[in-house]
Amino acid sequence: DSEEDEEHTIITDTELPPLKLMHSFCAFKADDGPCKAIMKRFFFNIFTRQCEEFIYGGCEGNQNRFESLEECKKMCTRDNANRIIKTTLQQEKPDFCFLEEDPGICRGYITRYFYNNQTKQCERFKYGGCLGNMNNFETLEECKNICEDGPNGFQVDNYGTQLNAVNNSLTPQSTKVPSLFEFHGPSWCLTPADRGLCRANENRFYYNSVIGKCRPFKYSGCGGNENNFTSKQECLRACKKGFIQRISKGGLIKTKRKRKKQRVKIAYEEIFVKNM
């Protein structure tokens, strides 16, 4: 069905950097629990990358639940890391430098570096490719610059820019993507396409969770991650079913193809699930 893959067509072109979290529980879905109370709580939404309100039933649920917006932000957003890194004598390490290395929940293992607060050095570990926390750097140098002390006991570099909350880079903050979609499929569908380390050029498909489509990419033949499919159909089968389009204030988003819609009630909002 050639139109199948054109189902979700309207979304911003903004590509988000990989999401890194302070705590893995910030990635849990909002869970109202089995009880019937109506309690206003907050959770961190990994798709909007913001703390949002939800209705909690009063029992069970998970750790991604906070009494206040402030508490949620403190635990799950990096607003407090977006301060200017202090210069010279006033310099401090960002608090994420003290977090334990976290491989995350995916299994597309790649080399990353973390600051080991015990040895006071940046060290190598294997990152699974998604989630985890911000004590996670693509290069040893980046890790050293941000977390290690220089010879006189302060940071190696003096940065006059803000620390990017999402990808640890010292750049202006990225633009936010409207919260149009939710994803409830396998976690690796959220990982970026990864060519891997070899030299082949194999035609593969990966699920682009930003636009909700399977897209072609060139695979090197080794390494990479699990967001890697030999056909578009296989990619859609694995990842598309978890892709849910949310109602926005402007009503239901138009799609290229009309389909029967089945209404589902979930906690605090209504969503439409396409019959696949």
């Epitope: 334990e100 290395e101 976290d102 491989p103 293992y109 790649i110 080399t111 080991n116 015990q118 040895t119 050095q121 060290e123 190598r124 570990f125 294997k126 290069t139 040893l140 380390l197 070899c198 033949g221 080794c222 390494g223």
Partner: antibody, heavy 118, light 112 residues
Framework: EVQLVESGGGLVKPGGSLRLSCAAS????????MSWVRQAPGKGLEWVST????????YYADSVQGRFTISRDNAKNSLYLQMNSLRAEDTAVYYC???????????WGQGTLVTVSS | DVVMTQTPLSLPVTLGQPASISCKSS???????????LNWLQQRPGQSPKRLIY???KLDSGVPDRFTGSGSGTDFTLKISRVEAEDVGVYYC?????????FGQGTKVEIK
Amino acid sequence: EVQLVESGGGLVKPGGSLRLSCAASGFTFSSYAMSWVRQAPGKGLEWVSTITTGGSYTYYADSVQGRFTISRDNAKNSLYLQMNSLRAEDTAVYYCARQDGQFLMDYWGQGTLVTVSS
Amino acid sequence: DVVMTQTPLSLPVTLGQPASISCKSSQSLLDIDGKTYLNWLQQRPGQSPKRLIYLVSKLDSGVPDRFTGSGSGTDFTLKISRVEAEDVGVYYCWQGTHFPFTFGQGTKVEIK
């Protein structure tokens, strides 16, 4: 001197459980990720599991995922491997190993033998 | 998973003579950080493994300089310039570039 001493091995029936321990000394245990590697009789080495410095996160080989649980107690300088639903193919000498700052195994214990047989 | 293949599996050598062990990986061991995490272990009879060489050619402390490691990409070699009696045992190459870590089958070095 870095020392790793494994214990807890023995004979167990298929489907049974066993808990291995590794006592570490001679280094700051909490500074290092730790691993278990096994060696079946007369065979080569197979990586089993790794745990991060603080013990919050773990890695497992597909062959043991869901059956084995690695854990650590930094206050006691100890590493553990809880092995459930044991199979004949789990029979091996189990070594604990320290991961250095390059995430490479640099020191190994003397091993403890686990035999799974009816 | 990355397959590590060692040759030969058995290596009878004369004391004082050189020895060479080859290790090939099914994919490149050059990591994205530019390092190659290829390592060699020595396991003497009845003992636990001991790390000899890491990152292709770096000798662990206390390892005699008659041991040298070389290679890149997928082809690696461990050389002993002059074999001594204490070198008897099984030598394993293993890779720490890709997860899971994988080991070669081992090469048994014995005196002729």
